[in-house]
Interface confidence: medium
């Protein structure tokens, strides 16, 4: 019968060539009677064997990425009769693995959105890297995640590539942030390789700042003979948010006098001071009203940020005209 | 510090002319209506005249309108009351005071120069 | 225009006393529009109370305004030396209008 152990070739050997092992028939009594041949994908040129004693060796550098088996078939023959001592049989050769090949980020570019204020712990995303080389030979293809740049806003999980927040940001002061993710095989030991991804992370915003005046005073004037619904100017307020968030709505806090109202253009965020009723130069020629801004929409675990309304003082001086 | 200190009183005939300046220090003067305000000797207090902060308004007492300009020179931190065709019920101390942001009262007022018309 | 009137013309008072001075107006003023100043002898006024009855910065407490549309009051709770001075009313709404003062003297 036949007798060999399992073969094994270590890939990117960089010999002309390399013993592998030996196909022998017990039969054989080392007179140099039979003649061993190699058949199958590879025999003759990736793997030769030597006739007379059954030494196989591998005569070209190996890729296990590339193929990582063999499956030849082995025949002797009596030199004398020409006949087969052995029936033909089929042998594999495995290509063993060494880490040559770095850890890969297959999906970037990666890119989440997370909404600004998130707690530490927040999940953000997961980053995923491949390695090429044999995930059960050894630590070749262990993978170990670090993170080279976002540090304190970011961490990532060693073994699961999760990046969480680990400090509360905040949209108004950075709204986007670059990641960089190391992933390590050979669970960062000695003779380790390394790849590399970027994240971009955007923060979402979140309505944690209120409408404030742009001015503490505004002065306006109103002619007398002004109808009541005339428009007799505009005051603003600016928000740090974005979109929704910064819809805000004026109105009237304070007018003794009940002359004035407030209304809110929704397209450029202004208010409009509007005459209720005519003024009279005669029996009052100056007003002064207070006016507050809020924002349109707060959710209720964000009202801690919108305490207090701002508020601007308006002082309007009534324009005299000549009566007949 | 904060202060308002009136200077240009003296004594004039009627029907002349006199200019009164007011120099603001410590604050910033550029964002206040300013006022002058006067007082005949032994009697109340009346307002004379007003400058909105950015000299774009001005408004005066009945007993002054066109015979008395206010103005202001904000690069300067100064504000002026130039007097002309005076009269003998001119006569009084002369105060500049500044407005409030927040209302048209007087929270503060310069030591006051007199102003005497006699012929 | 608003005509401003104080009550009394002098009031005689010792130190420690409670002052009480009455501004009454032609026609009704909003409390926002009134104010109070103390001038003492060779001074200029002085802001004690606005908007009827806020005390103005650094006015010690024993001040205190109030009122309402056509009656105010200013009302000083118990008399200082340095309190002994002339004190007007001013209305505010329409132009600036100032009552002739109210004496607070030395009994």
């Known amino acids: 019968g036949w007798v060999w152990n399992q073969f094994f070739v270590p890939e990117e050997m960089n010999t002309t060539s390399h013993h592998i092992g030996q196909l022998r028939s017990d039969l054989d009594n080392g007179n140099n009677s039979f003649q061993y041949k190699l058949l199958g994908a590879g025999a003759g040129s990736t793997f030769i064997i030597d006739e007379r004693t059954g030494d196989i060796y591998a005569i070209q550098k190996l890729d296990r990425e590339e193929r990582s088996l063999y499956i030849l078939r082995a025949q002797v023959i009596d030199i004398a009769t020409g006949r087969a001592v052995e029936p033909e049989s089929e042998f594999v050769i495995k290509v063993s693995d060494i880490n040559d090949n770095e850890p890969k980020f297959l999906d970037e570019p990666y890119e989440a959105i997370v909404p600004e204020m998130s707690p530490e712990g927040t999940l953000v995303i997961q980053v995923t890297a491949s390695d090429a080389d044999d995930p059960s030979s050894g630590n070749n293809a262990r993978l170990l995640y670090s993170l080279l740049q976002g540090q304190p806003y970011f961490s990532v999980e060693p073994t699961t590539g999760v990046i969480r927040i680990s400090s509360k940001m905040d949209r108004e002061l950075q709204d986007e942030y670059w990641v960089i993710i190391q992933a390590k095989d050979m669970i960062g030991q000695p003779g380790a390789l390394s790849g590399t991804t970027s994240v971009l992370i955007k923060l979402s915003d979140v309505n944690d700042n209120k409408p404030i005046f742009k001015e503490s005073l505004y002065r306006l004037t109103v002619s007398e003979s002004a109808p009541t619904g005339t428009s007799i100017g505009t005051i603003m307020a600016y928000d740090n948010d974005i979109g929704e968030n910064a819809e805000m709505d004026y109105s009237i806090e304070e007018d003794d006098s009940q002359t004035f109202d407030i209304i809110t253009n929704h397209e450029t965020q202004e208010g409009i001071v509007i005459l209720k009723k005519k003024v009279d130069f005669e029996h009052q020629n100056h007003y002064g009203i207070r006016a507050k801004v809020k924002n349109h929409h707060v959710p209720e675990q964000l009202m801690k940020y919108h305490t207090e309304a701002s508020t601007t003082f308006i002082k309007i001086q009534v324009e005299d005209v000549d009566e007949p | 510090q904060v202060q308002l200190v009136e200077s240009g009183g003296g004594v004039v005939q009627p029907g002349g002319s006199l200019r009164l300046s007011c120099a603001a220090s410590g604050f910033s003067f550029s964002s206040y209506d300013m006022d002058w305000v006067r007082q005949a000797p032994g009697k109340g207090l009346e307002w004379v005249a007003v400058?909105?902060?950015?000299?774009?308004?001005?408004y005066y007492a009945d007993s002054v309108r066109g015979r008395f300009t206010i103005s202001r020179d904000n690069s300067k931190n100064t504000l002026f009351l130039q007097m002309n065709s005076l009269r003998v019920e001119d006569t009084a101390v002369y105060y500049c005071a500044r407005e409030t942001g927040e209302g048209w009262y007087f929270d503060l007022w310069g030591q006051g120069t007199l102003v005497t018309v006699s012929s | 225009e608003i005509v401003l009137t104080q009550s009394p013309g002098t009031l005689s008072l010792s130190p420690g006393e409670r002052a009480t001075l009455s501004c009454r107006a032609s026609q009704s003023v909003s409390s926002s529009y009134l104010a109070w100043y103390q001038q003492r002898p060779g001074q200029a006024p002085r802001l004690l109370i606005y908007g009827a009855s806020s005390r103005a910065t650094g006015i010690p407490d024993r001040f205190s305004g109030s009122g309402s549309g056509t009656d105010f009051t200013l009302t000083i709770s118990s008399l200082e030396p340095e309190d002994f001075a002339v004190y007007y009313c001013?209305?505010?709404?329409?132009?600036?209008?100032f009552g002739q003062g109210t004496k607070v003297e030395i009994k």
């Open positions: 400058i909105w902060y950015d000299g774009s308004n001005k």
């Open positions: 001013q209305q505010y709404g329409s132009s600036w209008t």
